[in-house]
């Protein structure tokens, strides 16, 4: 069975990492698991990952935004950032404004890598299913 | 035969959905159906959807933005929105201005689906090939 | 063995199209070639390319951005640009800013493309590994 | 920038025909609507179509019960408009106005061409 | 078609002042991206002007006093203190289908 993944926002996330829905919806879950926000490989192998974020605010006052995909493994101290996108001055002063920030890229993961989504700015995440998501598949 | 698509803009359409040009240029498609701006599904499978609208305009005046890619099937009363980006206070008042909006994940589809990208403003949408575009591939 | 390539920002990048780290890090380099910038296609198929650049300034002054990848084939006169991204009029004079631009696509590849990015702007561009990379698979 | 500007000032007699023309200017003609909107004196404002020059589709307000036809020429960048069997209540200013495609509103308007209709 | 009243006919208001204006809409305007419905200003002699666009967004160069709101088919036009150059006659336009209709107009003049 292919190694799929796709989770949409989960609007009662409250701490890093982004947690997710991924039982209901538009949501694809097979051949990994998905583990306090984190997607667990459980086969070696080339996979490519992507993410979306939608932030959005009522009054811009240009809070820098990044949205990181990164990986962690009990081998390793620390956690890899494996895709990053940051934004600065991205919007007129008390408009109402909105915008979004999307990663994708192919990486070489090992069984037991945990993949996690973290953004600089909780409360500008609107978690629409359409808007925000998170996934992979095994190529 | 690989079930893919990638279509690209195409510049003298005024209806939503969107219209692409399936024939000419860097264009693909093979094992899966254009249909009125729609790209028809024949197999049931696990497909990367992804699409990439560049918008433009002389004069800016943040006229709110949505990119949308979404799904119809005759079995289903409503569409399913599967990716949206959308974009408010984008650019300087007045100025001319340019901003890309990309969406691309994973989704399980079913022979008979039609998928379409719908914007919110056609006449602020460029159709050149490289900038404004639609696909799949079967994984 | 899975044709397959992701290569991360070099910071020593001084003239078009962008060099590549294509060793260290999160490098990934399989039954493709690297050579002065481009990936270089040795099997005809159909595959996924994608591309991400961050750009960023300490002063804003709403410089004209474009981010295109591209192809090269001795067999033809001109290059073709697979897929651009444009942006104007993106953030407040004067400010620190910082925007991405990401590029993903499916192509129809002959053995002996060669596959490039340019940008408009190069020292405005940030080489991070997890910012700037470009990476195709073949599907 | 942006401009619409229109021909001038018109009278003619009932059951005749008017063309108003409008060229476009500081915009790519192609790729927004053009409608044309009036204003009968000392009233509001009446819808009555549009056109699309890049493809030369339009639509018209059912009111105008085929009177009237909307065309435009891509090689100047002008739009017309031509209301036929003219009666005294078409008496107008006659408005011509950019209308981006989705969200339909006008952003920008042409100076108004004055048609009077009497015997 | 829709149609569109708005009111009041007259509105007498000092310089200073704020000035409200309704529009209704005899069906909802609204999806559930935008409202479609506009505000423009005429003065006589002139072309209407475009000045908020989907229900609330101000358009590009016309002055921060102005602004509007609502949904479905109540709709407000707001200018926080009128201004000389303010006194005009306001319509409200819809764009949700065809045909587009404009409502009748609301005359704002000095008190």
């Known amino acids: 069975l292919r190694k799929v993944a796709h989770l949409t926002g989960k609007s009662n996330s409250r701490s890093m990492p982004l947690e997710w829905e991924d039982t209901y919806g538009i949501v694809l879950l097979s051949g990994v698991k998905y583990k306090k926000g984190g997607l667990v490989i459980n086969e070696t192998g080339l996979y490519f990952v992507y993410s979306k974020v939608y932030f959005r605010g009522q009054s811009c006052n240009n809070l820098p935004l990044s949205h990181k995909v990164y990986m962690r493994n009990s081998k390793y101290p620390q956690d890899l950032v494996m895709m990053e996108g940051k934004m600065m001055s991205y919007c007129t002063t008390g408009q109402m404004w909105a915008r979004s920030s999307y990663l994708g890229a192919v990486f070489n993961l090992t069984s037991a890598d945990h993949l996690y989504v973290n953004v600089s700015e909780l409360s500008l995440v609107n978690f629409e299913e359409s808007q925000t998501f998170f996934g992979l598949y095994k190529l | 035969l690989r079930k893919v698509a990638h279509l690209t803009g195409k510049s003298n359409s005024r209806s939503m959905p969107l219209e692409w040009e399936d024939t000419y240029g860097i264009v693909l498609l093979s094992g899966v159906k254009y249909k009125k701006g729609g790209l028809v599904i024949n197999e049931t499978g696990l497909y990367f959807v992804y699409s990439k609208v560049y918008f433009r305009g002389q004069s800016c005046n943040n006229l709110p933005l949505s990119h949308k890619v979404y799904m119809r099937n005759s079995k289903y009363p409503q569409d399913l929105v599967m990716m949206e980006g959308k974009m408010m206070s984008y650019c300087t008042t007045g100025q001319m201005w340019a901003r890309s909006s990309y969406l691309g994940a994973v989704f399980n589809l079913t022979s008979a689906d039609h998928l379409y990208v719908n914007v919110s403003e056609l006449s602020l949408v460029n159709f050149e090939e490289s900038q404004t575009f639609f696909g799949l591939y079967k994984l | 063995l899975r044709k397959v390539a992701h290569l991360t920002g070099k910071s020593n990048s001084r003239s078009m199209p962008l060099e590549w780290e294509d060793t260290y890090g999160i490098v990934l380099l399989s039954g493709v070639k690297y050579k002065k910038g481009g990936l270089v296609i040795n099997e005809t198929g159909l595959y996924f390319v994608y591309s991400k650049v961050y750009f960023r300034g300490q002063s804003c002054n709403n410089l004209p951005l474009s981010h295109k990848v591209y192809m090269r084939n001795s067999k033809y006169p001109q290059d073709l640009v697979m897929m651009e991204g444009k942006m104007m009029s993106y953030c407040t004079t004067g400010q620190m800013w910082a925007r991405s631009s990401y590029l993903g696509a499916v192509f129809n590849l002959t053995s002996a493309d060669h596959l490039y990015v340019n940008v408009s702007e190069l020292s405005l561009v940030n080489f991070e590994e997890s910012q700037t990379f470009f990476g195709l698979y073949k599907l | 920038q942006v401009q619409l500007v229109q021909s001038g000032a018109e009278v003619k007699k009932p059951g005749s025909s008017v063309k108003v023309s409008c060229k476009a200017s500081?915009?790519?003609?192609?790729?927004?609507?053009i409608s044309w909107v009036r204003q009968a004196p000392g009233q509001g404002l009446e819808w009555m179509g549009w056109?699309?020059?890049?493809?030369?589709?339009?639509q018209y307000n059912e009111n105008f019960k085929g009177r009237v036809t909307i065309t435009a020429d891509k090689s100047t960048s002008t739009a017309y408009m031509e209301l036929s069997s003219l009666r005294s209540e078409d008496t107008a200013v006659y408005f011509c106005?950019?209308?981006?495609?989705?969200?339909?509103?006008?952003?920008?308007w042409g100076q108004g061409t004055l048609v009077t209709v009497s015997s | 078609e829709i149609v569109m009243t708005q009111s009041p006919a007259t509105l007498s208001v000092s310089p200073g002042e704020r000035a409200t204006l309704s529009c209704r809409a005899s069906?909802?305007?609204?999806?559930?991206?935008?409202?479609?419905i506009h505000w423009y200003q005429q003065k006589p002699g002139q072309p209407p002007r475009l000045l908020i666009y989907?229900?609330?967004h101000l358009e590009s160069g016309i002055p921060a006093r102005f602004s509007g709101s609502g949904s479905g088919t109540e709709f407000t036009l707001t200018i926080s203190s009128l201004q000389s150059e303010d006194f005009a006659v306001y319509y409200c336009?819809?764009?949700?289908?065809?045909?587009?209709?404009f409502g009748q107009g609301t005359k704002v003049e000095i008190k």
């Open positions: 106005a950019r209308s981006l495609i989705s969200t339909a509103m006008f952003d920008h």
């Open positions: 500081g915009y790519t003609f192609t790729r927004f609507d």
């Open positions: 056109i699309f020059p890049g493809d030369g589709s339009s």
């Open positions: 069906k909802s305007v609204s999806t559930s991206d935008f409202s479609y």
């Open positions: 989907l229900a609330s």
């Open positions: 336009q819809h764009s949700r289908e065809l045909p587009r209709t």
